[in-house]
């Protein structure tokens, strides 16, 4: 039997996606304009390079990182690109409406594109938990809900807790992880008999996933420093992130070998653990004054990541139906929490050192921010999961989970599987 895209989705997806795109174009037409004030073209180029780094991270890094499934690599990469493209457009509008709209028009700057790319990155982290079990129409819903939830979370945190751009965006790790896990929890879990092989990794896709990990590894310092205000903060963030990811690579590879009875290195462990330091150091990367602390963080993060990759997949597979190789969700949830805890610890050390009596209040604020991020992630994730379960989206049948042929035309394959 030929494996065609379900007829109902053929009607639904183009109509849904193109209508949405037309709506976005109209919103851009009526409500946005470019920042016309740029005087310094050299500054423009330098500023664009940061945005370019973020786009490379999103499109190539996260796109390929999620492409390790034997029969779902094409979809992983292309669907990621689709979500990124859609997510950036909606995030620019949403951020503008939330922060600038009283003034009448949304001014688009390179900074707003930077913010939007980072918001869209949240979806690409979350989607790792559900890729292969949903179609593009469902992913469109996920993009819209998650970007909206993250945008509102950032605005609420900014207004209530008075955090700066960097701090309220660094909740992205925890937010994206818990959002993705809660969506996955809502989707049909058991893989039917005979499809287990599809969620296994294969050598070529695993190599492309490693390529994705390498791109993320190279550009993570740009991500952690993108929203910082002053050169000294950005310098600290770049250095500390670099040291942290460097140590987490060494820890990941050696820890993976240590965790295996025969001392062999697991591809899956390495894919995620190389990024561990970058996630863990994210929240406090600009505050750490010396390399050794960032390196210790990278070491701890690498160990946690390898430990998590060894012991958590079984639990995640049973409870959430997440395949063994989709470990970004629980990895980022653990490491994001570690990063937030490190920030709180630094806060405690600082307030104790200063002796200004504000320790309890500052810690309470930070815990409040973190709790709010997790609650909104879980609530919006559950809402998204429930929406994705609606019949109108014509979700792939469980027998066709993790299968490129459901979505792609392969001319060399005369018949389906």
């Amino acid at each position: 039997m030929s494996s065609k895209y379900p007829r109902s989705v053929r009607r639904c997806l183009p109509l849904w996606a193109l209508t949405l795109e037309a709506a976005l174009i109209l919103l851009f037409y009526f409500f946005t304009h470019y920042d016309a004030s740029l005087e310094d073209q050299k500054g423009l180029v330098a500023s664009y390079q940061v945005g370019q780094d973020l786009t490379v991270m999103a499109a190539i890094g996260l796109g390929f990182l999620t492409s390790s499934f034997r029969r779902h690599s094409w979809s992983s990469v292309a669907f990621n690109l689709f979500m990124l493209a859609l997510g950036v457009q909606w995030a620019i509008l949403l951020d503008g409406f939330l922060s600038q709209f009283p003034s009448g028009k949304v001014v688009i700057t390179l900074f707003s594109i930077r913010l939007a790319t980072m918001s869209a990155l949240s979806v690409l982290i979350s989607v790792d938990a559900v890729l292969g079990k949903v179609n593009l129409a469902q992913l469109v819903v996920m993009v819209l809900v998650e970007v909206t939830a993250l945008g509102n979370l950032r605005m609420v945190i900014s207004n209530i807790f008075n955090t700066d751009y960097h701090m309220n965006m660094m909740h992205i790790y925890v937010f994206a992880a818990y959002f993705g896990l809660s969506v996955a929890w809502c989707l049909p879990k058991p893989l039917p008999e005979g499809t287990e092989d599809k969620d296994q990794t294969a050598t070529i896709p695993s190599l492309s996933a490693m390529l994705g990990a390498l791109f993320l590894w190279m550009f993570w310092p740009s991500f952690n420093s993108a929203l910082l205000r002053s050169p000294i903060e950005r310098k600290n963030a770049v250095f500390n992130t670099y040291y942290a990811v460097a140590v987490s690579v060494v820890t990941a590879i050696s820890g993976s070998s240590l965790a295996h009875p025969q001392g062999k290195i697991s591809k899956t462990y390495v894919h995620s653990a190389v990024l561990a330091g970058g996630v863990a150091v994210g929240t406090s990367c600009h505050l750490i004054p010396s390399p050794w602390l960032a390196m210790v963080l990278g070491l701890v993060a690498g160990l946690i990541s390898v430990g998590g990759a060894k012991y958590l997949p079984g639990c995640c597979n049973r409870v959430l139906g997440i395949p063994h190789s989709s470990i970004m969700g629980y990895n980022f949830s653990l490491l994001g929490l570690l990063g937030e805890i490190i920030y709180i610890v630094l806060l405690v050390l600082d307030t104790v050192g200063a002796g200004n009596g504000m320790i309890g209040f500052q810690v309470l604020l930070s815990i409040g921010e973190l709790s709010l991020a997790i609650v909104i992630a879980l609530m919006s994730g559950l809402l998204t999961g429930l929406l994705l379960n609606l019949k109108i989206w014509k979700a792939p049948h469980e027998a066709k989970y993790f299968d490129d042929q459901v979505f792609w035309k392969f001319p060399h394959l005369a018949v389906g599987f």
């Epitope: 310094d40 700057t109 008075n162 700066d164 205000r229 050169p231 630094l346 600082d350 504000m358």
Partner: antibody, heavy 126, light 108 residues
């Protein structure tokens, strides 16, 4: 020595436009965020806008959002404030100021305006 | 937005007096508070940042204290050149910064 010199002030009619400039010297201009702060006659200081060191981000007070635009040219060591659709309440002395970021211990950075220009007067009158 | 309230709005003092100016924030700002001095017809000048750190070149008779919502600027022994208007300013609620309404210190 470190110096900021504003220019471009004057009398302008309501609804019209004006562009203020601030020339910086004696420090590496491209390494510092810059602010505009104004002071209406007989009143206190009011923060207007900030631009980050690389020009990547700009933030404005609600009272000027959508009307004023802050920009900089790091190659010319100059900060600008483009004032459109000016109102009577925009009458003030406009100061440019340099932003210094400092950190103690592991705390969040402190931002402070450590160097100020002498100011330029803008009068909105018909 | 965070509101800053200074008290008193003006005070009269003599040379040699100890003067204290208070600044209150509408919500906790930790130690993200700066003090400025402005003389008539002149630009403001930074005195103290991070609530208690003296800016270089500022005489040691100026000191700042406080955290959270309550801050004070103290001039231990008022000098003739200290007669001016003093402003507090918060940098916690970035991106928007707010100043207090000012305290004018006059000669008695």
């Amino acid at each position: 020595q470190v110096q900021l010199v504003e220019s471009g002030g004057g009398v302008v009619q309501p609804g019209r436009s004006l562009r203020l400039s601030c020339a910086a010297s004696g420090f590496t201009f491209s390494s510092y965020g810059m602010h505009w702060v104004r002071q209406a006659p007989g009143k206190g200081l009011e923060w207007v806008a900030v631009i980050w060191y690389d020009g990547s981000n700009k933030d404005y007070a609600d009272s000027v959002k959508g009307r004023f635009t802050i920009s900089r040219d790091n190659s010319k060591n100059t900060l600008y404030l483009q004032m459109n659709s000016v109102r009577a309440e925009d009458t003030a002395v406009y100061y440019c100021a340099r932003e210094l970021s400092t950190q103690r211990g592991y705390s969040r950075y402190h931002y402070v305006m450590d160097v100020w220009g002498q100011g330029t007067t803008v009068t909105v009158s018909s | 937005d965070i509101q800053m309230t200074q008290s008193p709005s003006s005070l009269s003092a003599s040379v040699g007096d100890r003067v204290t100016i208070t600044c209150r924030a509408s919500q906790s700002i930790s130690t993200y508070l700066n003090w400025y001095q402005q003389k008539p017809g002149k630009a403001p000048k930074l005195l103290i940042y991070a609530a208690s750190t003296l800016q270089s070149g500022v005489p040691s008779r100026f000191s700042g204290s406080g955290s959270g919502t309550h801050f004070t600027l103290t001039i231990s022994s008022l000098q003739r050149e200290d007669f001016a208007t003093y402003y507090c300013q918060q940098s916690y609620g970035t991106p928007t910064w707010t100043f207090g309404q000012g305290t004018k210190v006059e000669i008695k």
